[in-house]
Interface confidence: low
């Protein structure tokens, strides 16, 4: 059967019908419905929302909608022993305490079950000691402290500002520096954009607002107690002592009003340079400890949170493919929120809901996609991508054989300036072609394509006339699909102007003030940006599921592989003497990249010419495209990170949110000048070059003519 026979009407008409069915008003209505109460993972409220979504997806017309449950480790504050930080005097009296909750936003004063700000998975503890200010607690910040300023964090409580890197990396760095506790805070320099009012009068963070979040270092493991396997009814669970990625020191987040009280008394060393100063009226002294009159005062943390194995629920909807039902295109986003989830995740969940409704409408009219589409509402993303990872662990054998692509659908907006896309190079051409067909929602670009406004506002740093597309990192539910299983993945959302707004994320991220009103009043009153994101995400899913030949271009992988090889070579060449001494050569990698480029080019030529009416040949060519991403997976994983198995991309070891290219080589080279055994360190560099070169060559060979 050809695609057209299976689907009644022409593919182009199908796509138009699908996109025309998406309505901004519906997304608005769904967002309102999903944000009236908190939906914290593991709570009854979130279970009820799962059942509601299951019921509505069935009504929309999906073939089946099931709940998939798992019992995973979650973390909650102790209701009777609130977490807080105090300043204590020499007699041990608490002379200042941080606030126990955020002042609720107008209209939400009587809502119950708002979880107070906490750092999920912090161990219990009541450490006390002197404070050290560690800037963003990045690797380079601790290098500056320990190596340049000779400040020892051992036995100290460190205070770090949120931003720049994933909070779990901050905590890991603090632990490695010997700290006995971590205080995280939001500095106005990062979470208060100039010229904008605080919520409820604008989209800025008020002084009492606090960012929640997990502080795990899971490295892709999923549930900390069942790494590699689903947390099902017969799971063998590790003891808490052996759990993956749990922090070993207490951690707690605060707002900038409370941070002011701690930082204003700081003594010790002055900040090393202006990059360590935020926007509070404090000296940003590094410490350790308080100044002069206050030098006998200490900081004490009171953390009583508990880790509990709790049931979570994913919603999995299926729209069966007419021609290739055993090929899966997945659209997934999470449902659990820290509080109301006005942006994260419900601006994404509302878009997924509308995409399901549109696909369902087409199905009711007799249409089916060529390939099966799976829709997922993930649980417990905020606690470490747990719902998506457990489901993928349970279904890994099916996914690695049948998974065509995964499109992520968390927050649809983090601003309203332009589009932001992170994806595998295989999807570059799909994204370019799709955005050329969509209308831009941006002011000043009426009648112009989305591609045009996106390229103008966010140009590619390498290619003139093209938009920037970034590497996939982590911190969201695509992680297991891309980094572990090697399924081609992508994500899209509307973002801010990074040139003029240097704050990290959006100011109200993970706070109680992330409400429906925040979106409706300040970010997207007409829901036109949400609609555009629905068109991009939905359009990508449509094309991936319905095009006769998969819309992947392997030549784009060849281009980036050369770019990444050049980049890692130039990093290594900062050590020319050592490269000579230890005979370090990148020849094998460059040779493999050259081979990949040539083979990809020939494959693309064959792709233009082959007989698409021959279902066996069509399937063969599509399988070569589908399995190309899989070919970059090393079954042994990266050093010390067994669940990060993609050789070309991994989350940065210094910032989970960021993607790193040739991560094995990059990590082997990182800070190599400080390694105690240079021979061993350069030996590891050589081993990683070998692994990368072999993998690129092996992937190239999957594109060769099969016989």
């Amino acid at each position: 059967k050809s695609s057209n026979e299976a689907t009644n009407i022409t593919p182009k008409h199908n796509m138009k019908a699908f996109l025309d069915e998406l309505k901004a008003e519906n997304i608005k209505k769904f967002l309102y419905n999903f944000t009236q109460i908190p939906h914290l993972a593991g709570t009854e409220q979130n279970f009820q929302l799962a059942k509601q979504i299951q019921s509505q997806w069935k009504e929309f017309g999906l073939d089946s909608v099931e709940l998939a449950h798992y019992d995973v480790l979650l973390s909650y504050p102790n209701k009777t022993h609130p977490n807080y930080i105090s300043i204590i005097n020499e007699d041990g009296n608490e002379i200042f305490n941080t606030s126990l909750f955020e002042p609720p936003p107008p209209g939400y004063e009587n809502v119950s079950d708002i979880v107070p700000p906490f750092s999920a998975f912090s161990p219990q503890g009541m450490p006390e000691g002197d404070l050290v200010y560690v800037n963003y607690a990045r690797t380079e910040d601790f290098f500056k402290l320990e190596r340049d300023m000779k400040i020892n964090c051992s036995g100290k409580i460190v205070i770090a500002r949120y931003g720049k890197v994933f909070r779990g990396n901050k905590v890991k760095n603090a632990q490695l520096a010997g700290a006995k506790g971590v205080i995280l805070y939001s500095d106005p320099a990062d979470y208060f954009a100039p010229g904008v009012k605080s919520y409820p009068d604008g989209w800025n963070l008020p002084g009492g607002g606090v960012q929640r979040g997990n502080i795990l270092n899971l490295n892709g493991a999923g549930d900390p107690l069942t790494p590699g396997y689903p947390a099902n009814e017969y799971a063998y669970r590790r003891g808490i002592a052996e759990a993956v990625g749990l922090p070993s020191i207490p951690v707690h987040p605060i707002g900038y009003y409370d941070a002011q009280k701690l930082l204003e008394k700081m003594g010790g060393s002055a900040p090393p340079d202006s990059s360590w100063r935020g926007s509070l009226k404090v000296p940003y002294n590094v410490g350790p400890g308080f100044t002069g009159n206050f030098s006998t005062q200490k900081v004490k943390m009171h953390i009583h949170s508990t880790n509990e194995v709790t049931r979570i629920y994913n919603v999995i909807g299926t729209l069966r493919g007419a021609v290739e039902p055993d090929r899966y295109v997945i659209l997934g986003g999470h449902r659990d929120s820290w509080v109301f989830g006005g942006i994260d995740p419900q601006s994404g969940a509302a878009v997924v809901h509308e995409i399901v409704r549109s696909f369902g409408t087409l199905k009711k009219e007799g249409w089916r996609p060529r390939r099966t589409i799976l829709f997922a509402s993930w649980d417990a993303e905020e606690f470490g991508l747990l719902g998506s990872t457990e489901w993928a662990e349970e279904n890994s054998r099916l996914l690695q054989e049948r998974g065509v692509a995964y499109i992520n659908a968390d927050s649809s907006i983090e601003g309203n300036y332009t589009l932001r896309v992170d994806c595998t190079p295989l999807m570059y051409s799909l994204v370019h072609n799709l955005t050329k067909e969509l209308k831009s929602p941006d002011e000043g670009f009426e009648g112009k394509s989305l591609y045009e406004s996106w390229t103008k506002k966010s140009p590619s740093p390498e290619f003139s006339g093209m938009p920037r597309i970034s590497k996939l990192g982590s911190g969201n539910d695509f992680e297991v699909f891309f980094q572990r299983l090697g399924i081609a993945s992508g994500r899209a959302r509307y973002t801010k102007n990074w040139e003029t707004n240097k704050f990290s994320g959006y100011p109200l991220y993970h706070s109680v003030y992330e409400t429906y009103e925040l979106v409706e009043k300040f970010y997207d009153p007409m829901f036109k940006y949400h609609l555009t994101v629905a068109q991009v995400r939905g359009g990508m899913v449509f094309e991936l599921a319905n095009s006769i030949v998969l819309p992947f271009d392997c030549r784009d992988y060849a281009v980036v592989l050369r770019k990444y090889a050049d980049k890692i070579y130039s990093i290594s060449m900062k050590h020319p003497q050592e490269m000579k001494t230890y005979s370090v050569s990148f020849d094998s990698l460059f040779s493999a990249v050259k081979n990949f480029t040539e083979i990809a080019s020939k494959f693309s030529e064959r792709l233009q010419d082959f007989d698409k009416s021959n279902p066996i040949v069509l399937r063969m060519m599509n399988d070569q495209l589908m399995f190309l991403e899989r070919a970059f997976i090393d079954p042994l994983g990266l050093p010390d990170r067994p669940f990060y198995r993609h050789v070309i991309y991994a989350p940065s070891s210094h910032n989970k949110y960021a993607g790193e290219s040739f991560p094995g080589i990059y990590d082997a080279l990182f800070d190599i000048e400080s390694k105690v055994d240079p021979s061993k360190a350069w030996g590891e560099v050589k081993r990683q070059i070998y692994v990368a070169a072999f993998t690129v060559q092996a992937a190239a060979e999957t594109l060769s003519e099969v016989a």
Partner: antibody
Framework: EVKLEESGGGLVQPGGSMKISCVAS????????MNWVRQTPEKGLEWVAE??????????HYAESVKGRVIISRDDSKSSVYLQMNSLRAEDTAVYYC???????WGQGTTVTVSS | NIVMTQSPKSMSASAGERMTLTCKAS??????VSWYQQKPTQSPKMLIY???NRFTGVPDRFSGSGSGTDFILTASSVQAEDLVDYYC?????????FGGGTKLEMK
């Protein structure tokens, strides 16, 4: 069956050094944090040191009484944990037990005697 | 350092009797308390962890309770082989510390 077997104890002079070892079996050693605990009739049970697993960056912690004089280490390939003791004092005389986190399994102990 | 104080230092019991040992922490240690039994010439063995959870293979006559600063180990019906030394210990914070022990003797 979980087994922990210490070795390497004996007589050493004050100021001297000694390295004691513990070999584990019956469980996935690399996943577990390991401790050394010592016991004397005078002081009873006293925790000495802890080393965490690879997923916790092999973090180490020490009792104040031994800090700077002892080093705990592990070799996951040999399922072994070690305690290198330097600048030994008479008060370090004790039976040294290797224990698995949270002290839920103990070895039979090895005796270290510091005396001239 | 957190001091764990056990009482009594020694006590007498007859077979079949109920025994109660107490352990007091100098500051709040949540439920991060374990109880150990040590027989002559042997190493300590865990009886209770997390203040109230029986460790694998421990007879159900042993039970633990308490949280915060006050903890109790109970043997509902003492057997002859139970007349040995018992220690409590905390793993709430560094350094981990143990009580001085209670010696249980034959009446």
């Amino acid at each position: 069956e979980v087994k922990l077997e210490e070795s390497g104890g004996g007589l050493v002079q004050p100021g001297g050094s000694m390295k004691i070892s513990c070999v584990a079996s019956g469980f996935t050693f690399s996943n577990y944090w390991m401790n050394w605990v010592r016991q004397t009739p005078e002081k009873g049970l006293e925790w000495v040191a802890e080393i965490r697993s690879q997923s916790n960056n092999f973090a180490t912690h020490y009792a104040e009484s031994v800090k700077g004089r002892v080093i705990i280490s592990r070799d996951d390939s040999k399922s072994s944990v070690y305690l290198q003791m330097n600048s030994l004092r008479a008060e370090d005389t004790a039976v040294y037990y290797c224990t698995r986190r949270w002290n839920n399994f103990w070895g039979q102990g090895t005796t270290v005697t510091v005396s001239s | 350092n957190i001091v764990m104080t056990q009482s009594p230092k020694s006590m007498s019991a007859s077979a079949g009797e109920r025994m109660t040992l107490t352990c007091k922490a100098s500051e709040n240690v949540g439920t991060y308390v374990s109880w150990y039994q040590q027989k002559p010439t042997q190493s300590p063995k865990m009886l209770i962890y997390g203040a109230s959870n029986r460790f694998t293979g421990v007879p159900d006559r042993f039970s633990g309770s308490g949280s915060g600063t006050d903890f109790i180990l109970t043997a509902s019906s003492v057997q002859a082989e139970d007349l040995v030394d018992y220690y409590c210990g905390q793993s709430y914070t560094f350094p981990y510390t143990f009580g001085g022990g209670t010696k249980l003797e034959m009446k």
